[in-house]
Amino acid sequence: LVPHLGDREKRDSVCPQGKYIHPQNNSICCTKCHKGTYLYNDCPGPGQDTDCRECESGSFTASENHLRHCLSCSKCRKEMGQVEISSCTVDRDTVCGCRKNQYRHYWSENLFQCFNCSLCLNGTVHLSCQEKQNTVCTCHAGFFLRENECVSCSNCKKSLECTKLCLPQIENVKGTEDSGTT
């Protein structure tokens, strides 16, 4: 099966790489604009230059193109704890990230929030914190993992999943209660 091509892709595929078909005259192939520029005017004829202009401040194009407007630079989301890693240039969008000892949690494909890496108090680091993943902790005896924190088994309710992990401790507590002094 032939994959379905969009109109723009169909038009571009008629011309060699780095060129696009003139929108008003499909016998003319115009040279695409370099990254950092956008299309101001199509080339007037074969072998003639495309009129490309540099993107204005606050906008960019990251690859060769025949866009009529540059793309707006992204802004890092302070409300998500994001910080600017590198600022926007005419040929590259803003790069946003997190501070040291934080990781990115993606709520959706294009939205992430920065959270502090877990320190594994009352446990040990099983896997170190990474750019897109929190530390993986292993808890010491007498503690269980809840939302990536090691919590004392004394906070384990019978109905919760922790009962399996805390079973020896729970039995010990029962044992102490049951053993009367004779």
């Epitope: 989301r77 409300e79 709520w107 929190n134 939302e147």
Partner: nanobody, 119 residues
Framework: EVQLLESGGGLVQPGGSLRLSCAAS????????MVWVRQAPGKGLEWVSH????????YYADSVKGRFTISRDNSRNTLYLQMNSLRAEDTAVYYC????????????WGQGTLVTVSS
Amino acid sequence: EVQLLESGGGLVQPGGSLRLSCAASGFTFEHEGMVWVRQAPGKGLEWVSHIGEDGQSTYYADSVKGRFTISRDNSRNTLYLQMNSLRAEDTAVYYCANIPKAGPSFDYWGQGTLVTVSS
């Protein structure tokens, strides 16, 4: 005690509009970023839109961009979601919540309000 109470859901025809409200109490509303999430039948939670504590910074999922508008009234401790040009795929239970601070889970959220888009 933190309480979040959503309202404004209902049955609406495709192309119609609804305005959801979320009344908040038990915390300092104006110091919290707020979010609307939704859960369609048999699907996971989807982050729909959020608004910063200042009311200026907003975000919309691609699926609702240009159709939904989030806003807040800090004097009334209320969060809103204006939903226009509704589609069948917007059918879901809508919840409001605080933007989490400590980790990627919601500390508090309401009982939700059901939005059904059907002809």
